[in-house]
């Protein structure tokens, strides 16, 4: 009978970094080993390929490598086929994106004394914590009529005034690393007294 000496196990992995799913098999006859991802055979590429009976990743990809991997062994003489335990990656990643206007719907609708909400489109796993900046200066919660939570990706200005004008950017960090906004947002609010 086919015996798995080493079975693949679920593990943490970093986006773009190396990883290895191990599989070692013993059987009476010569063995063919191949891998399944969500039940479909894994084809070798430069990025992901069989290394002996193990599966090697030159650069883990959160989209292409999400799912359940299984090592499958076939004894060529007896015809027996057996599958290993399931294994998957907990892929840690962070990806930069722009700062966008969430409310109101368009810049034309921004008026003094209205509420303005900006959104930081930096995503990641685990969920990152966010830091906002105006003209390069970090913003902390509760100062100058704005609400910001490091857990939330939104910055709310209520009410918005001329003192809030400036270039808004954000950065986020997680166990994987840090990223800052790829595109920033310039907020211009005219002084009503003029």
């Amino acid at each position: 009978a086919i015996v798995f000496i080493k079975q693949p196990s679920s593990q943490d992995a970093l986006q773009g970094r190396r990883a290895l799913l191990r599989c070692e098999v013993e059987a009476p006859g010569p063995v063919h080993v191949y891998w399944l991802l969500d039940g479909a055979p894994v084809q070798d590429t430069e990025r992901r390929f069989a290394q002996g009976s193990s599966l090697s990743f030159a650069a883990v990809d959160r989209l292409q490598d999400s799912g359940t991997f299984q090592c499958v062994a076939r004894d060529d003489v007896t015809g027996e086929e057996a599958r290993s335990a399931n294994a998957s990656f907990n892929i840690k990643w962070i990806e930069a994106g722009p700062v966008v206007l969430k409310h109101p719907a368009s810049e034309a609708e921004i008026q003094p004394q209205t509420q303005v909400t900006l959104r930081c489109h930096i995503d990641g796993h685990p969920r990152p914590t966010y830091q906002w900046f105006r003209d390069g200066t970090p913003l902390s919660d509760g100062q100058s009529n704005h609400t910001v939570s490091s857990k939330e990706r939104n910055l709310t200005l209520r009410p918005a005034g001329p003192e809030h004008s400036g270039l808004y950017s954000c950065c986020a960090h997680s166990a994987f690393g840090q990223a800052c906004s790829s595109q920033n947002f310039t907020l211009s609010i005219a002084d009503e007294s003029f």
Partner: antibody, heavy 113, light 111 residues
Framework: QVQMQQSGAELMKPGASVKLSCKAT????????IEWVKQRPGHGLEWIGE????????NSNEKFKGKATFTADTSSNTAYMQLSSLTTEDSAIYYC??????WGQGTLVTVSA | DIVLTQSPASLAVSLGQRATISCRAS??????????MHWYQQKPGQPPKLLIY???NLGSGVPARFSGSGSGTDFSLNIHPVEEDDSAMYFC?????????FGGGSRLEIK
Amino acid sequence: QVQMQQSGAELMKPGASVKLSCKATGYTFTGYWIEWVKQRPGHGLEWIGEILPGSGRSNSNEKFKGKATFTADTSSNTAYMQLSSLTTEDSAIYYCARGKLSWGQGTLVTVSA
Amino acid sequence: DIVLTQSPASLAVSLGQRATISCRASESVDSFGNSFMHWYQQKPGQPPKLLIYAASNLGSGVPARFSGSGSGTDFSLNIHPVEEDDSAMYFCQQSKEVPRTFGGGSRLEIK
């Protein structure tokens, strides 16, 4: 012990289809590949294809695509191979085998007008 | 497809002597540290019987007079000493790739 019992000889007309059976006993049917091999006098042995009954997954020789279809019934531990659009070239002995070790006795198919 | 060329197509060997059959593959049949090359014996009216698997491993119940060797593309089956009962057809087969392919066969006659 492992045994592969194949169905009896068939005399068929050109253009017809035939379904050969291979009943497996003595092992867990779903976990082993069953292969099919053709033998014609003077043509040696030809590998047609294979099926893993537990999953229904199969592999086949490109040469027999459209000619041979593999199925398996796990309730009766029987594998089947259907041959379609028969011609005299399909006249042969057909073997089923579990891996390389356990072979059926063969089924003779004769195609004649 | 991997093409297997067997030679000779037929041979006649005296009782007690050595019979050697060769099988050459059009490309290597080695993978995972094994040679996926096998040898069968077939007698009239019977299915093929596995003699040697993975180039050099003796099949279950096969006498030690049978031996196999080789790797990559060149393989051979040896029978020594030959016995009367060894009169049969012998086939090599590769199972590294689909489609699995067989050699053309070698007929052994005992003198």
